[in-house]
Amino acid sequence: ALDTNYCFSSTEKNCCVRQLYIDFRKDLGWKWIHEPKGYHANFCLGPCPYIWSLDTQYSKVLALYNQHNPGASAAPCCVPQALEPLPIVYYVGRKPKVEQLSNMIVRSCKCS
Amino acid sequence: ALDTNYCFSSTEKNCCVRQLYIDFRKDLGWKWIHEPKGYHANFCLGPCPYIWSLDTQYSKVLALYNQHNPGASAAPCCVPQALEPLPIVYYVGRKPKVEQLSNMIVRSCKCS
């Protein structure tokens, strides 16, 4: 699987999950989240050659098409597969609230 | 929705479904499909700016991150959303077989 265990410990050039730290204020302009100040969101990057963790029958077809037509702009793209929630603290007035923001952290990628 | 109805009738530059015809022999090297000889597979293409048909909370975060960090390689990607099957005819010996190949045709796209 193209997950953090594999991707973070390898020098994989093809589609894989990469490390990305996002600071809520600096990178998003969000001031409403009190904690954490930022988080390891990660992101997906890398080419999607034929047979590389392809998502659907269509992804296989498109990767094979791309192999036969190297100059074509049609190609599968490396996108998130497994996403995890992020617990946050924010304030409503002076009262702290804890909430889970769903689908915030990329754990693995796929070619779609 | 970024579907064929909207995308094929507009000059949309952002993420949208685009027309693509795939010839099974020429483009994929497949000789086993008797009919059709090819089909309109379509593909997804175009940038994914903030608020443009974003798939998950993560996609929104990444698009916003990209807006604040324009040079970053981390950005959402335009990928298939709705896929449709394709009926095909192939031969087993001299006997024709009809089958539906699932997830073969792109009907709409999303930013993931």
Epitope: Y21, D23, R25, K26, K31, H34, E35, P36, K37, G38, H40, P87, V89, P96 | -
Partner: antibody, heavy 117, light 102 residues
């Protein structure tokens, strides 16, 4: 490399005020929270507050509310901590420390504040 | 305020032996915990951030584990240079309180 250089030791009388500076270099000063922490003699640590130099936003430990003022000068990349109405229990080493990824990764060398009549 | 409780308060270890320090939070802090080492006359040095991540330049004999309320700092093989006071600190809403030190 990241460097936080603090002002020297200070001696103050009870009820006086003290203002300590922390000059930052080697990173984007405006886009990282700066924390202030103190350590009383032979004691543990006490978090006092933090400031975001980019917009001046602050979070204070309620224990110091009204006595503690955190400021930052982005033209000189310097953070300031001012504590007023000093008492003998405020005698401590005061540290500035950069906030990063659920931690304070770089600390100043500390500034000893002595409160004595 | 969240209360951080460290155990033990004192830990004599022979060089080459493993060591572990526990830190318990009075409420769920998820993975928002850091570990520091303070040597006499020095500022604290970050060892572990976000509960399990090794800070830059910290030897791999140090490791952190846990989430929620219970956390552990482990040293696989103690060296003479590891002497000092170890502190945990949470980062789950201000004030960011510390453990009392080991």
């Amino acid at each position: 490399q990241v460097l936080l250089v603090q002002s020297g030791a200070e001696v103050r009388k009870p009820e006086a005020s003290v203002k300590i500076f922390c000059k930052a270099s080697g990173y984007s000063f405006t886009s990282s929270w700066m924390n202030w922490v103190r350590q009383a003699p032979a004691q543990g640590f006490e978090w006092m507050g933090q400031i975001y130099p980019g917009d001046g936003d602050t979070n204070y430990n309620g224990k110091f509310k009204g006595r503690l003022t955190l400021t930052a000068d982005t033209s000189t990349n310097t953070a300031y901590m001012e504590l007023s109405s000093l008492r003998s229990t405020d005698m401590a080493v005061y540290y500035c420390a950069r906030h990063y990824d659920g931690s304070t990764d770089y600390w100043g060398q500390g500034a000893l504040v002595t409160v004595s009549s | 305020d969240i209360v951080m409780t460290q155990t033990p308060l004192s830990l004599p270890v022979t060089p080459g032996e493993p060591a572990s320090i526990s830190c318990r939070a009075s409420e769920n802090i998820y993975s928002n915990l850091a570990w520091y080492l303070q040597k006499p006359g020095q500022s604290p040095r970050l060892l572990i951030y976000a509960a399990t991540n090794l800070a830059d330049g910290v030897p791999s004999r140090f490791s952190g584990s846990g989430s929620g309320t219970d956390f552990t700092l482990r040293i696989s093989s103690v060296e003479a240079d590891d002497v000092g006071v170890y502190y945990c600190q949470h980062f789950w809403g201000t004030p960011y309180t510390f453990g009392q030190g080991t």
